[in-house]
């Protein structure tokens, strides 16, 4: 089966419609919004997830200082255009013909323009910094235990190989997870760091994308790790192009 074996569902994406209409009566799942077939053994691309979400009914010193070129997703939700592989198209436009360029995680990296705006290529986000603040605990977590637990989590839950978890920094109560991945480093089947970061972000917010799996229960040596706030910084292979007026 292409999805879950016995009941036809998609374990890695609950925003899908599944039916046994694949080859040989196999379970096949399609993302809401786009209708694109998804591989339920791995994460669905962020672009397809955003599209599905928009179509759904509404209801210190050791720490890294983000570079001046780091992007934060301030624009929030929008209905993206995805390519046939489920990646973000370099140029995104809204219904009022306002357009902008995005990076590989769908975050705006230029000023907004009109339909004449050109985005020559999809610029890859090769470095993601996830900045977490955890709730007070009896004592600080052991750094190496925390590092091991987060690497295990990213491998087992998000299928991200530990090679792409470049570092875990800790200065109580701040945890920073650095994900790094150049295009050339990705081998067949490797999860994209942008997709892993998005699933993690949704888990932290209590909005898990997984089907029927419990929410995120993060523990370090049995001690619950509860996150109070999250900030994610995105660094692109080519720095973003914003006008000076935005920076002031």
């Amino acid at each position: 089966h292409t999805a879950a074996q016995d009941n036809c569902t998609c374990p890695t994406n609950k925003m899908t419609v599944c039916s046994p209409d694949g080859p040989g009566g196999r379970c096949q799942c399609r993302a809401l919004g786009s209708g694109m077939a998804v591989d339920c053994s791995t994460l669905t691309s962020k672009c397809l997830l955003l599209k599905a979400r928009m179509s759904a009914p509404k209801n210190a010193r050791t720490l890294v200082r983000p570079s001046e070129h780091a992007l934060v997703d301030n624009d929030g939700l929008y209905d993206p255009d995805c390519d046939p592989e489920g990646r973000f198209k370099a140029r995104q436009c809204n219904q009022t013909s306002v357009c902008w360029c995005v990076n590989s995680v769908g975050v705006r990296r230029t000023d907004k323009g009109d339909l004449s705006l050109r985005c020559d290529e999809l610029v890859r986000t090769h470095h993601i910094l996830i900045d977490l603040r955890h709730r007070p605990t009896a004592g600080a977590f052991n750094h190496s235990d925390l590092d091991a637990e987060l690497r295990r989590l990213f491998r087992e839950r998000y299928r991200l190989h530990p090679k792409f978890v470049a570092a875990v920094h800790y200065e109580q109560p701040t945890i920073q997870i650095e994900l790094r991945q150049n295009t050339s480093q990705k081998a067949a089947g490797d999860v994209d760091i942008g997709d892993a970061a998005y699933y993690f972000e949704r888990d932290i917010k209590g909005e898990s994308l997984f089907q029927g799996r419990g929410g995120l229960d993060l523990r370090v040596r049995g001690e619950p790790l509860q996150v109070e706030r999250t900030l994610i910084y995105y660094l692109d292979e080519i720095p973003p192009k914003f006008s000076m007026k935005r920076l002031t």
């Epitope: 074996q5 295990r152 491998r155 087992e156 480093q185 067949a188 089947g189 490797d190």
Partner: antibody, heavy 119, light 108 residues
Framework: QVQLVQSGAEVKKPGASVKVSCKAS????????MHWVRQAPGQGLEWMGE????????SYNQKFKGRVTITRDTSTSTAYMELSSLRSEDTAVYYC????????????WGQGTLVTVSS | DIQMTQSPSSLSASVGDRVTITCRAS??????LNWYQQKPGKAPKLLIY???RLHSGVPSRFSGSGSGTDFTLTISSLQPEDFATYFC??????????FGQGTKLEIK
Amino acid sequence: QVQLVQSGAEVKKPGASVKVSCKASGYTFTSYWMHWVRQAPGQGLEWMGEITPSDGYTSYNQKFKGRVTITRDTSTSTAYMELSSLRSEDTAVYYCARGHGNYVSFDYWGQGTLVTVSS
Amino acid sequence: DIQMTQSPSSLSASVGDRVTITCRASQDISNYLNWYQQKPGKAPKLLIYYASRLHSGVPSRFSGSGSGTDFTLTISSLQPEDFATYFCQQGYTLPPYTFGQGTKLEIK
């Protein structure tokens, strides 16, 4: 078609090192993980380590405690596995195998290289 | 490390029989379970990946099922060329990736 061709059998003395090669063809060498797995006579399979040919990243089975080193030469699409401080229990057939990043399934294997450690 | 336990360690069967081999993981490995066939003096061959997906070129008489900790490999109608040793392997967690001890399938 995908092919992994390994170097020939080796006989080594205890304490010596052995370096086995694995030449890949029929696919883009840098686009897949390469793993090394060994099998002692009449025994099961044991994973030794992995490499991503694109950047040379490696990870190893801690059982081998720094005795194993996996390298690659992208110009010749060849992966290498070197095992040092050989002992008699290292007598085995050593395989290279192409791996998938998500399933960690080994879809194509080399023919195997028998390494005999004997005084 | 995750331990993989296969049963039985050996079994005898006849051509045309339906055969089932089981593999149990020491912890939940979701669906990240692969099956291999190995003949004497040869390298293993991938049969099934992700618990139930048939590798290209593998006959449809082979099938896999299971999730979590318990998995099965089924051969619906044994052919003479199927007599071999079968191994399961998990690819779920951080390395090392581990194999079952093998199941030897012999002619009755």
